[in-house]
């Protein structure tokens, strides 16, 4: 039974607007038509789910309307964007990929992307 490797960047810096983007790439052992991608955040050994999407190969990822994640897929690559990040959201963001259909089922977990978020300095008061 083959393993499924999932690759993601080691470190990403969020923009000053609190947006971080990274690619989650998986080496598919089979011809999956239905894929589920989950992003989890690990900080201080606590793990929480950030967002998840199931998509059909060739179609767009669809996250829930209130999700902080958006994404696009291209082949075995998923381009993920997380918005609304603040300094307290710094942590290890883990990409988990599941090949749901057709059987056999495969699961792969990336090494995680350490996302650093720095809150912007407040603008100084101005007379103008």
């Amino acid at each position: 039974c083959k393993a499924m490797h999932v690759a993601q960047p080691a470190v990403v810096l969020a923009s000053s607007r609190g947006i971080a983007s990274f690619v989650c790439e998986y080496a598919s052992p089979g011809k999956a038509t239905e894929v589920r991608v989950t992003v989890l955040r690990q900080a201080d050994s606590q793990v929480t789910e950030v967002c998840a999407a199931t998509y059909m190969m060739g179609n767009e990822l669809t996250f829930l309307d209130d999700s902080i994640c958006t994404g696009t897929s291209s082949g075995n690559q998923v381009n993920l964007t997380i918005q609304g990040l603040r300094a307290m959201d710094t942590g290890l963001y883990i990409c988990k990929v599941e090949l749901m259909y057709p059987p056999p089922y495969y699961l792969g977990i990336g090494n995680g992307t350490q996302i650093y978020v720095i809150d912007p300095e407040p603008c100084p008061d101005s007379d103008f």
């Epitope: 989890l40 050994s45 793990v47 789910e49 699961l107 977990i109 990336g110 090494n111 995680g112």
Partner: nanobody, 115 residues
Framework: EVQLVESGGGLIQPGGSLRLSCAAS????????MGWYRQAPGQGRDLVSH???????MYADSAKGRFTISRDNAKKTLYLQMNSLRPEDTAVYYC?????????WGQGTLVTVSS
């Protein structure tokens, strides 16, 4: 190096119950997924169930209602309670562990359901 050791297999009559265990040793990432696969004679390995360290559980259709997966994170041990066993449940049951960037298999434990 991570090692997985399964136990609890054996010969059981139809309708009976078994509890499989899988003990992990070595360094494991705090987020991980542990699961059970089974391989019937002449077949491929099929997922039975898995459970993540944060409690998320998935069951294959064949396991729903009769099998219950659980884990003890402190002991790094995975369990599979199998009830109402049928002859078609006869297989080698393998433990699998997914950690960040890697996965591992146990050697398997044989479950035979026969009268």
């Amino acid at each position: 190096e991570v090692q997985l050791v399964e136990s609890g297999g054996g010969l059981i009559q139809p309708g009976g119950s078994l509890r499989l265990s899988c003990a992990a040793s070595g360094s494991i990432s705090s987020y991980n997924v542990m699961g059970w696969y089974r391989q019937a004679p002449g077949q491929g390995r099929d997922l039975v169930s898995h459970i993540a360290s944060n409690g998320e559980i998935m069951y294959a259709d064949s396991a729903k209602g009769r099998f219950t997966i659980s884990r003890d994170n402190a002991k790094k041990t995975l369990y599979l309670q199998m009830n109402s066993l049928r002859p078609e449940d006869t297989a080698v049951y393998y433990c699998k562990l997914w950690v960040l960037g890697n996965d591992y298999w146990g050697q398997g434990t044989l479950v035979t359901v026969s009268s």
